[in-house]
Every structure is written in structure tokens, then in C-alpha cells.
């Protein structure tokens, strides 16, 4: 679609006569008829296939024609066409004499023609005017012409329709050749596709307007490049949505089971060494001078009765000191200056000479010990309590204070964790060294088989169009992550294509 524009500039008819040579009365009141048609090797007046237009009376005999386009007038003359411009044309311009105001052919004199010109040739679409001048025996006409495209039509033939728009159907302006030029932030054939925030993940993110980054299910973060872990995941991460890959030292479905109690809680005090021994289970190895499950109790160094032969122990800041009884010496009063003649054995101990009487040895009755039978036997020195139990002296006997999960005189018996039937929903209980383990029936999971789980919801491949399926264990459902161009809970609907355009 376009317009053939004809600008009449000057008409000369000095003698004021018709084409016949007859003088006009009262003068040649001149108007023009223009006929635009398809190319003809010899132009004939037949149907004006591209259009026709007439002017009012523009002047008498000889006159210049005013450019009237700015005022909405009729010069340049407009011959619109609604087809592809063929690049060639024929043009007939007739000058007619109208004695009166009625310009209809039947109202004109029989020989009202003043002049007629016919031209034909090639003409490309463009803004530049072609100037021409045609002379006949009695007249001269100067004019210019061009072909331009109508609004919203572009290209060499005005055949490409392009209407700038900024709405749901596209965001573009039109280039001179009719191709679309997307507005900033838009892309695609019809500039319908927003350009998402720079860096927005190609698969996991999308946008409905430029510089936006909306995340698909299972993804989060400014650029939708962070997966959302399983709901309830405590100490875990994911590489795909709904995963819960436990951090080091954590276990269980939700990574909420502490496998590294030592690191996470540092239970051992006073510089003790901590060893993990199962879930929420640990053992503290105390430094000298400390005791207790967590080595929280400070031991007096004299508690171990290091002084022999009745020596008395004194605590000091950096250790202890033995005050030896007469006849003894040494760090622990272990050296005797006595002989059996000095009756050195206490508590009914019997004395035996050694080294020709230079030394002796005491043979102690039960419950006494020491080089002079001066000590009651400490039944805890041999560490009789197993499994980390604490040994306590109680008069002539001893007792073991057991750690949780153990019993028996020497804490040698493991309490059966399975005794209280901790596994729910018919789970099978297994005693372990440091606790128990439940083997769950189908449809249940968790440490105690307390979590109801469905068969993998993705097992039936419910997602269409190569979508990725994720099982949401917290809701026993699946989530389909659609590839670009598909929507719907199962990605079953293609996104509606834009309507076809006529170019």
C-alpha cells in the first residue's frame, strides 16, 4: 500500500487556446485530470487501473501551482494504491477548460481539452521527487512525482506491513525495510520474548518483562541458580530441587541427625580428646587430673594415694608432695631405711627380710596394700567398669556408675534399645553398639519409621514434553519443571504461538 504523489508546478498556455486551437472563452480556466495505470508500451486512455484524480480550476491560461500540502490542499495530488508497487507505471495528465463551475465531463464544451500528456517508465519507491516537463504545440507543463509507502508499509514495493507496537503481541518499531526492531529488553521474531535479568538461569529462570528473573518450581535466588532443598532439610544442601544432601557430620532424611557431636557441640571439657561413637554419642579421653563423662571433674593428684609407706600427700599447684614417715624416703616414700626389726608392716602385715637384712618386704592381709600395707585396697585402680562407666569406692566394695545404655556390675551389659519397641508402623528394630536401627516397611521412612512416604510419584513419568520431574516427599506429589515453550501442571500445553502476520 502506498501513494503516487504528483506535484503540479507550472502550466503555460500563452495563447489561451484549447488543443483544437479554438480560443477559450473567457479564458482557459484550467483544471487537471490525472490517470495512473499499469505500464503500457504505448499509453492509451483506457481504465486508470492504479487510480484517478481531478483538481479544481487551478488558474487561467498560464499559472504556477501553489504547494498546498501543508494546508491540507490538493497539491501534491495523491493517488493511493493498495497493492504491491510494481516499479513501473503509465501516467496521463490532461488539462481541461471549464467555462463554468461544473467540472463534470458532460458540462464541458465538446472540445474542452487543452492538452494531454502521457508518460510511462520505471519508478522506485523513495522520498526523492522526479522533475519532468512536457511540451506540446501550444502548452507546457512542469511537474514532479514520486511513490512513497503508506503509513505502516515498508520495503521496495510497499508490500511489507509493519505497525509499531508495545503490547502483549510485540514490542518493536519498524525499520525502513519493514523488518522489526525490538524495543530495549525484548527479543524473538516478533519481539514478544522479554530479555531476562542478566545471568538469569536459562532453564530454571524465566521472566514476563525485561530485567526480571522469576524462578521455576524448585529454584530460588536472584538468578534462580540455587535449588530449593527438600522441605525440612536442616543441615543439608541440594544440586537439583528437593534434594537433601547432608553436610559432613549429619545424617538422616532431613540431615537433622548429628553424626559429629564432638565438632558441633564440643562436649569434652578441660582439653580432653573427643571421639564420635555414633549418633549423638561420644567418648571423652580426659587429660591427667580430670575425670567425669565430659572430663568436667578435676581430680586431686593425691586422690590416687601416690605416697607409700604411710607417707602423707600434699597437693601442690604443679603436682603433689609426699611427706615420708621416719625410715622412708624417695618421691613416693618408696625407699625404706627400716628392717623387720623396726616392725614396718601395718595392718597385720608380716615382714620378710631381704638382702641379708638390708631391706624387707611386707606381705599384706586382704583389703590392704602398699609397701607397708598402709593402704586400703582401691578397687577402682584396675578400671573395672566397662563402656565408659565411672568407678566409685564404697567401703570394702566398689560400684560402677554406668553411662546411658549400659548396665551390669561392671557396665558390661548393653541395655536393649529395642526393648521399648521404638520402631513405628511395624518397623523391625536392630540393636547396635551405639543405639538402634529401624528397618521400615514399604511406604514409611525416618529414624523410627514415623514418616509416611508414597511410592516415588515420578515413577509413572507424569511430565510431558521432556520436562524434569521432582518428587516432593513432604506432600507425596510430583512437580514438573517445564522446558521453555510449555506450561501446565504436567507441561502438557504449548505456549500459544503469536498470530500469523501477513508479511
Amino acid at each position: 500500500s502506498g501513494v503516487f504523489q504528483l506535484q503540479l508546478q507550472e502550466f503555460i498556455n500563452e495563447r489561451g487556446v484549447l488543443a483544437s486551437g479554438r480560443p477559450c472563452e473567457p479564458g482557459c480556466r484550467t483544471f487537471f485530470r490525472v490517470c495512473l495505470k499499469h505500464f503500457q508500451a504505448v499509453v492509451s486512455p483506457g481504465p486508470c487501473t492504479f487510480g484517478t484524480v481531478s483538481t479544481p480550476v487551478l488558474g487561467t491560461n498560464s499559472f504556477a501551482v501553489r504547494d498546498d500540502s501543508s494546508g491540507g490542499g490538493r497539491n501534491p495530488l495523491q493517488l493511493p494504491f493498495n497493492f504491491t508497487w510494481p516499479g513501473t507505471f503509465s501516467l496521463i495528465i490532461e488539462a481541461w477548460h471549464a467555462p463554468g463551475d461544473d467540472l463534470r465531463p458532460e458540462a464541458l464544451p465538446p472540445d474542452a481539452l487543452i492538452s494531454k500528456i502521457a508518460i510511462q517508465g520505471s519508478l522506485a519507491v523513495g522520498q526523492n521527487w522526479l522533475l519532468d516537463e512536457q511540451t506540446s504545440t501550444l502548452t507546457r507543463l512542469r511537474y514532479s512525482y514520486r511513490v512513497i509507502c503508506s503509513d505502516n508499509y515498508y520495503g521496495d514495493n510497499c508490500s511489507r506491513l509493519c505497525k509499531k507496537r508495545n503490547d502483549h503481541f510485540g514490542h518493536y518499531v519498524c525499520q525502513p525495510d519493514g523488518n522489526l526492531s525490538c524495543l530495549p529488553g525484548w527479543t524473538g521474531e516478533y519481539c514478544q520474548q522479554p530479555i531476562c535479568l542478566s545471568g538469569c538461569h536459562e532453564q530454571n529462570g524465566y521472566c514476563s518483562k525485561p530485567a526480571e528473573c522469576l524462578c521455576r518450581p524448585g529454584w530460588q535466588g536472584r538468578l534462580c541458580n540455587e535449588c530449593i532443598p527438600h522441605n525440612g532439610c536442616r543441615h543439608g544442601t541440594c544440586s537439583t530441587p528437593w534434594q537433601c544432601t547432608c553436610d559432613e557430620g549429619w545424617g538422616g532424611l532431613f540431615c537433622d541427625q548429628d553424626l559429629n557431636y564432638c565438632t558441633h557441640h564440643s562436649p569434652c571439657k578441660n582439653g580432653a580428646t573427643c571421639s564420635n561413637s555414633g549418633q549423638r554419642s561420644y567418648t571423652c579421653t580426659c587429660r591427667p587430673g580430670y575425670t567425669g563423662v565430659d572430663c568436667e571433674l578435676e581430680l586431686s593428684e593425691c586422690d590416687s594415694n601416690p605416697c607409700r609407706n604411710g607417707g602423707s600427700c600434699k597437693d601442690q599447684e604443679d603436682g603433689y608432695h609426699c611427706l615420708c614417715p621416719p625410715g622412708y624416703y624417695g618421691l613416693h616414700c618408696e625407699h625404706s631405711t627400716l628392717s623387720c626389726a623396726d616392725s614396718p608392716c601395718f595392718n597385720g602385715g608380716s615382714c620378710r627380710e631381704r638382702n641379708q637384712g638390708a631391706n624387707y618386704a611386707c606381705e599384706c592381709p586382704p583389703n590392704f596394700t602398699g609397701s607397708n600395707c598402709e593402704k586400703k585396697v582401691d578397687r577402682c585402680t584396675s578400671n573395672p567398669c566397662a563402656n565408659g562407666g565411672q568407678c566409685l569406692n564404697r567401703g570394702p566394695s566398689r560400684m560402677c556408675r554406668c553411662r546411658p545404655g549400659f548396665t551390669g556390675t561392671y557396665c558390661e551389659l548393653h541395655v536393649s534399645d529395642c526393648a521399648r519397641n521404638p520402631c513405628a508402623h511395624g518397623g523391625t528394630c536392630h540393636d547396635l553398639e551405639n543405639g538402634l536401627m529401624c528397618t521400615c516397611p514399604a511406604g514409611f521412612s525416618g529414624r523410627r519409621c514415623e514418616v509416611r512416604t508414597s511410592i516415588d510419584a515420578c515413577a509413572s513419568s507424569p511430565c510431558f514434553n521432556r520436562a524434569t520431574c521432582y518428587t516432593d516427599l513432604s506432600t507425596d506429589t510430583f512437580v514438573c519443571n517445564c522446558p521453555y515453550g510449555f506450561v501446565g501442571s504436567r507441561c502438557e500445553f504449548p505456549v500459544g504461538l503469536p498470530p500469523s502476520f501477513p508479511w
Epitope: V17, L18, A19, S20, G21, R22, P23, E25, S44, P45, G46, W96, P99, R104, P105, E106, A107, L108, P109, P110, D111, A112, L113, S115, K116, S136, T137
Partner: antibody, heavy 119, light 106 residues
């Protein structure tokens, strides 16, 4: 139906006079130029005169100028040609014709009326 | 005075194309009309403004005009086309007719 019907022809002596009439019907007579064209026996067509729609403008062939007069009565839809000082060479069939405006030519013709100038 | 020159006669076989010319100085600058006249009948306008056919005139009649010559062309000539043909234009004194051409369909 568009129609032109001439009348008034006949035989007349040289120097004599005749008045030809042309009755128009089927179109708006007052809007059109009208003409008289004649054809001598065995000869070609010759334009005689024409008159504008309102009767203001009248044109004549050189051969009849000063002797013939064209006129019209739009109220009666009738065209006239007064023939005076007739000569032998004026002998012809006289046709009344509607002149199409704007160089269309003579688009409607009457059947003609014969004028014979003879002594 | 302005004279339009036509050949007195043209012959053509049925179904063939007949061309009748009309010549005058700078005739292409003017409009030419053509008339058909059969014996004993009034003339009938067959072409006006060089090449335009009035309604009712068969398509086999066509016209052209350029330079000094106007041409009436009858393609696929039929026996009923046998007639006298006159070209007509205008000069300063009024309408001018050519001398006429007798078309004979053999």
C-alpha cells in the same frame, strides 16, 4: 430511451430558408452541448454548428457562417437550426447530435432529415 | 484548416484484423473519436478519447493515437463490421471529420 428526432427538412429553392428542429428525450437536454452535422449524398460527414448547454456559446463552420443560426429551447428539449440563403451545396442529410462534453465526440445521433436545395 | 486524412478503403478477410488510420499534424496531442456508419443509417460512436469504447461496443474495437496518426483496429473482423468509418477531432473552428474509409469484409 435516449432519442433525437429531427424534422423540418424538405426541398427548397436556392436562396430559400428552412428551420430544422430536433426533439430530445431520455436525457437532461439542458446539461449538454448540442451540434448539427450534415452529410451530402455519397459524401462524408461535415460538422455544421454547435451550441453550449445554456445557449451562450455558438460556433459555426466557415461554410455556413452568417447564413445558418443554431439555437435551443431547453424548456421544450428542442434544438433548432435556421437555414437561410440556401445553396445547392447545402443539399445533405442533416443530423442532430448530442456532443459529449470533454472531447467524447458525438455520442447520440438522430436519424437525420433531408434538405434538398434545387431550382 | 485542419484536415484528417483516411484511406478511402480497407479490405479484410473475416476473422482477420483490420486497421484504419487517420493522420494529421500533431494529432497525438488531441483526442480522436471514431464513428461507424452503415448504409442508410446514422453514424454510431465506436471509440472516443483515442481508445475508450462506449458501452455496447464489442471489445474487438480498439483505438490508439500517438504522433501524427490515430488508428482504429478491429480484431477478428466479422461481416457485420462492413461499413464506413470516420475519424473525428477538433480544430479552431470546430469539429473536423476525416474523409471516411470503406471497410470491406471479403
Amino acid at each position: 430511451e435516449v432519442q433525437l428526432v429531427e424534422s423540418g427538412g424538405g426541398v427548397v429553392q436556392p436562396g430559400g430558408s428552412l428551420r430544422l428542429s430536433c426533439a430530445a428525450s431520455g436525457f437532461t437536454f439542458g446539461n449538454h452541448w448540442m451540434s448539427w452535422v450534415r452529410q451530402a449524398p455519397g459524401k462524408g460527414l461535415e460538422w455544421v454548428a454547435d451550441i453550449s448547454s445554456d445557449g451562450r456559446y455558438k460556433y459555426y463552420a466557415d461554410s455556413v457562417k452568417g447564413r445558418f443560426t443554431i439555437s435551443r429551447d431547453n424548456s421544450k428539449n428542442t434544438l433548432y437550426l435556421q437555414l437561410n440563403s440556401l445553396r445547392a451545396e447545402d443539399t445533405a442529410v442533416y443530423y442532430c447530435a448530442k456532443a459529449g462534453g470533454g472531447n467524447v465526440g458525438f455520442d447520440i445521433w438522430g436519424q437525420g432529415t433531408m434538405v434538398t436545395v434545387s431550382s | 484548416s485542419y484536415e484528417l486524412t483516411q484511406p478511402p478503403s480497407v479490405s479484410v478477410s473475416p476473422g482477420q484484423t483490420a486497421s484504419i488510420t487517420c493522420s494529421a499534424d500533431n494529432l497525438g496531442e488531441k483526442y480522436v473519436s471514431w464513428y461507424q456508419q452503415k448504409p442508410g443509417q446514422s453514424p454510431v460512436l465506436v471509440i472516443y478519447q483515442d481508445a475508450t469504447r462506449p458501452s455496447g461496443i464489442p471489445e474487438r474495437f480498439s483505438g490508439s493515437n500517438s504522433g501524427n496518426t490515430a488508428t482504429l483496429t478491429i480484431s477478428g473482423t466479422q461481416a457485420m463490421d462492413e461499413a464506413d468509418y470516420y475519424c473525428q477531432s477538433w480544430d479552431s473552428s470546430g469539429a473536423v471529420f476525416g474523409g471516411g474509409t470503406k471497410l470491406t469484409v471479403l
